[in-house]
Interface confidence: low
């Protein structure tokens, strides 16, 4: 009869018992170590800035439109301004500059100020274009949208961007954008290398 509480038979050679006795604390130790390591790694990750993990992201709100003959929209971002931020990319004179190569999700919404569907259609064409405006060698349009009969346009796309690319958002036409933060915003999010 086996002894109570033992996994080993007295008559059998005790190799299994020894192995099991050694293995249980070893596995338990490994599990504990793994749990501790994961926790510490997670804490370390939380302390690291997002950009150092490759998760470059920015969400911006409209600051102002350009002076005469300048169709660009000028953006601003930062915790003091509410729900806008920059982690990785930076603003250069109101234009967004990329700091890490990769494929990005670019998104934008622009609402025209003091606008109705009749105003929008009567003063067509009002268009919004997002593109790489510098360096000149990489200049290209990434998104082009027309307001047609609406007062708001929104779009997004995945596109490769490189360190140093500056994104410009050009609003052409006679209507001005709303500066309300829930109506006009622009952002990028790094997705993969």
């Amino acid at each position: 009869m086996p002894e109570e509480g033992s996994g080993c038979s007295v008559r059998r050679r005790p190799y299994g018992c020894v192995l099991r006795a050694a293995l249980v604390p070893l596995v338990a130790g490994l599990v504990i170590c793994l749990v501790v390591c994961i926790q510490r790694f997670a804490q370390a990750q939380q302390q690291l800035p997002l950009e150092s993990l490759g998760w470059d992201v920015a969400e911006l709100q409209l600051n102002h439109t350009g002076p005469q003959q300048d169709p660009r929209l000028y953006w601003q971002g930062g915790p003091a301004l509410g729900r806008s931020f920059l982690h990785g990319p930076e603003l250069d004179k109101g234009q967004l500059r990329i700091h890490r190569d990769g494929i990005y999700m670019v998104h934008i919404q622009v609402t025209l100020a003091i606008c109705s569907s009749t105003t929008a259609s009567r003063h067509h064409p009002t268009t919004l274009a997002v593109g790489i405006c510098s360096p000149a060698s990489r200049s290209i349009s990434l998104l082009r949208l027309s307001f047609h009969q609406g007062c708001t346009i929104a779009s997004q796309r995945l596109t490769p961007l490189a360190r140093g690319d500056t994104l410009c958002t050009n609003l052409t036409g006679t209507l001005l954008p709303s500066r309300n933060t829930d109506e006009t915003f622009f952002g990028v999010q790094w997705v993969r290398p």
Partner: antibody, heavy 118, light 107 residues
Framework: QVQLQESGPGLVKPSQTLSLTCTVS??????????WSWIRQHPGKGLEWIGY???????YHNPSLKSRVTISVDTSKNQFSLRLSSVTAADTAVYYC??????????WGRGTLVTVSS | DIQMTQSPSSLSASVGDRVTITCRAS??????LAWYQQKPGKVPKLLIY???TLHSGVPSRFSGSGSGTDFTLTISSLQPEDVATYYC?????????FGQGTKVEIK
């Protein structure tokens, strides 16, 4: 240097239409980015925005004035105009034209007093 | 519509005093606020826009602060030429509206 100058009759009879013109000198009314506004100030009181226009013909007026307001532009004369219909004594005010950089007013005319009285 | 309320409606201070005028919006307007100065018998002049940016040519004794619903115009050292009525104006959306004004006098 851009300057604005209001002109029009200083006295208007009740129920008639008030008509004012703002002449822009030293710059073009067609300059991109600038809207052109009318603002008024009742005697001894605060400022009230009436409405704006853009050289292309876009206009917007303060809903508090209902549909009494018409703002128009004459780019050939570098002028824009205000018409306020069915006036009453409550429309007696100093009327200013102002340059509007989309949002705030960075340049004002000297103002013209319009009295509504029979 | 968003209402703009200024306080006090008038104040009297000595030359060299620090003067503070407040403007409160009935709803949040981010930093989309301008301040104007109107001297007696004169035209209003833009002092500050974007809540804290001094318009060109405005003396540095004027400063603005605030965001959301509460804003402040400060004159760090009151001068005789600062006697005027000061107005705030919100411009985040139409209609543009002004505060009722704060009259500043010298004691």
């Amino acid at each position: 240097q851009v300057q604005l100058q209001e002109s029009g009759p200083g006295l208007v009879k009740p129920s008639q239409t008030l008509s004012l013109t703002c002449t822009v000198s030293g710059g073009s009314i067609s300059s991109d980015g600038y809207y052109w506004s009318w603002i008024r100030q009742h005697p001894g009181k605060g400022l009230e925005w009436i409405g704006y226009m853009y050289y292309s013909g876009i206009t917007y007026h303060n809903p508090s004035l209902k549909s009494r307001v018409t703002i128009s532009v004459d780019t050939s004369k570098n002028q824009f105009s205000l018409r306020l219909s069915s006036v009453t004594a409550a429309d007696t005010a100093v009327y200013y034209c102002a340059r509007d950089f989309g949002w705030y007013f960075d340049l004002w005319g000297r103002g013209t007093l319009v009295t509504v009285s029979s | 519509d968003i209402q703009m309320t200024q306080s006090p409606s008038s104040l009297s201070a000595s030359v060299g005093d620090r003067v503070t005028i407040t403007c409160r919006a009935s709803q949040g307007i981010s930093n989309y606020l301008a301040w104007y100065q109107q001297k007696p018998g004169k035209v209003p002049k833009l002092l500050i826009y974007a809540a804290s940016t001094l318009h060109s040519g405005v003396p540095s004794r004027f400063s603005g602060s605030g965001s959301g619903t509460d804003f402040t115009l400060t004159i760090s050292s009151l001068q005789p030429e600062d006697v005027a009525t000061y107005y705030c104006q919100k411009y985040n959306s139409a209609p543009r509206t002004f505060g009722q004004g704060t009259k500043v006098e010298i004691k």
